[in-house]
Amino acid sequence: KFSKQSWGLENEALIVRCPRQGKPSYTVDWYYSQTNKSIPTQERNRVFASGQLLKFLPAAVADSGIYTCIVRSPTFNRTGYANVTIYKKQSDCNVPDYLMYSTVSGSEKNSKIYCPTIDLYNWTAPLEWFKNCQALQGSRYRAHKSFLVIDNVMTEDAGDYTCKFIHNENGANYSVTATRSFTVKDEQGFSLFPVIGAPAQNEIKEVEIGKNANLTCSACFGKGTQFLAAVLWQLNGTKITDFGEPRIQQEEGQNQSFSNGLACLDMVLRIADVKEEDLLLQYDCLALNLHGLRRHTVRLSRKNPIDHHS
């Protein structure tokens, strides 16, 4: 469960994150599992540990093996394992399956290809992108931040996409490449008038004074990518940001896509330390898209504490 596969090419940078997470203040020790030898933290070493990250600058085939990371806090230790494999560079164009990151699929309306693992590196734009080893050229291809956008996607756009970037460590530059497959699906999307799944219209939500309360506004809009679709909360007909009560905040929930393909959105309203005056407010869950606006109103009522007297 706490073991992670990582791979890279010789003479390229490889950075691996410890599969066990901890606060930034926790110390992380790294070991080479076969020898139980500690990985140094000094940056002058080709392979060194830097907190949660293990850096191979650059990597060598001989670095392959299992590395142990131990996250140490004042109260506990957590152990994780990084299974690292460094491969020799291929002379031909083919990228073998074992070097491929997860496949992504796109459609005419949504064609972003993210460069895998790039967040671990200190890189600067622009990224270089290749398809089946050919540099991508033409206005249909746009490298933006850490992803590639393809305009007007066609079935011929399916294939293996490689991103190439430079990692900078203390003034030294190291090349990194990562490849993933892109498939094109025929997305027959549609858009509907919003349907609010929760809360029910005129729902009464019981809350306890002094406690925290959460209200979830959930709505579905159709199938596929939706335009101008949103769910949000209003208080007494006012945007949360304009209402000016710091105890009451809204937080985006999951962008859901159910097995039936419906595109749905959640927005959670968090009320900290519920006060009497909160019971007087009108809470509106709003769902909107191109077709219109639907509104469900909720009111809060005081939950009576259970009477423990006989």
Epitope: S191, F227, L228, A230, L286, L288, L290, G292, L293
Partner: antibody
Framework: QVQLVQSGAEVKKPGSSVKVSCKAS????????ISWVRQAPGQGLEWMGT????????DYAQKFQGRVTITADESTSTAYMELSSLRSEDTAVYYC????????????????WGRGTLVTVSS | EIVMTQSPATLSVSPGERATLSCRAS???????LAWYQQKPGQAPRLLIY???TRATGIPARFSGSGSGTEFTLTISSLQSEDFAVYYC?????????FGQGTKVEIK
């Protein structure tokens, strides 16, 4: 008389960003949706994206996704369009255009236009 | 995306004559979602027709729109000097909202 007043012409270098403003005078700004449409020299009209200021929600044509940001300030009745990573092909007149809200919802045609802002991208 | 194709690219008409402009959509759109605009050199577009056939406020009766499905028409019954301009159709049935490439109506 409702008007959409746009900011002045801009000359920009490739790779830079431009931010164009569109101020609504008269009428109720919060009851409009504002879209941005551009027109390259001698070319047709191209829709870029739309914002509904009342809800603070914006969305964009996929061609411009990641490169354009549309915002609105209800207090000044002003909408903004920022386009980054400019290239010579972005040389165009940029229009803001209004969609009015009827009793049911927004009518997504453009019933009022600003006079346009010429953005020239040149090294 | 829905591609809007206008024809002809240029239409030469004498003042007082009738002009018929065509707009074809690459897929069927409800007639409620088609608009026509007029644009004169150096000016912003101006809304003429929405919902395929409803004239916008202040638009003279000589402008009329018709059509449904994929075929739409803008008719100017008797061209006035101020009508010589470029005309664009636009679908707002589904995003991205798209415009035709325009028809230029010029004096014959």
């Amino acid at each position: 008389q409702v008007q959409l007043v746009q900011s002045g012409a801009e000359v920009k270098k490739p790779g830079s960003s431009v931010k164009v403003s569109c101020k609504a005078s008269g009428g109720t700004f919060s009851s409009y949706a504002i879209s941005w449409v551009r027109q390259a020299p001698g070319q047709g009209l191209e829709w870029m994206g739309t914002i509904i200021p009342m809800f603070g929600i914006a969305d964009y044509a996929q061609k411009f996704q990641g490169r354009v940001t549309i915002t609105a300030d209800e207090s000044t009745s002003t909408a903004y369009m920022e386009l980054s990573s400019l290239r010579s092909e972005d040389t165009a007149v940029y229009y803001c255009a209004r969609s009015s809200r009827s009793s049911s919802w927004y009518n997504w045609y453009f019933d009022l236009w600003g006079r346009g802002t010429l953005v020239t991208v040149s090294s | 995306e829905i591609v809007m194709t206008q024809s002809p690219a240029t239409l030469s008409v004498s003042p007082g004559e009738r002009a018929t402009l065509s707009c074809r959509a690459s897929q069927s759109i409800s007639s409620s979602y088609l608009a026509w605009y007029q644009q004169k050199p150096g000016q912003a577009p101006r809304l003429l027709i929405y919902g395929a056939s409803t004239r916008a406020t202040g638009i003279p009766a000589r402008f009329s729109g018709s059509g449904s499905g994929t075929e739409f028409t803008l008719t100017i019954s008797s061209l006035q000097s101020e009508d010589f301009a470029v005309y664009y159709c636009q679908q707002y049935y589904t995003t991205p909202w798209t415009f035709g490439q325009g028809t230029k109506v010029e004096i014959k």
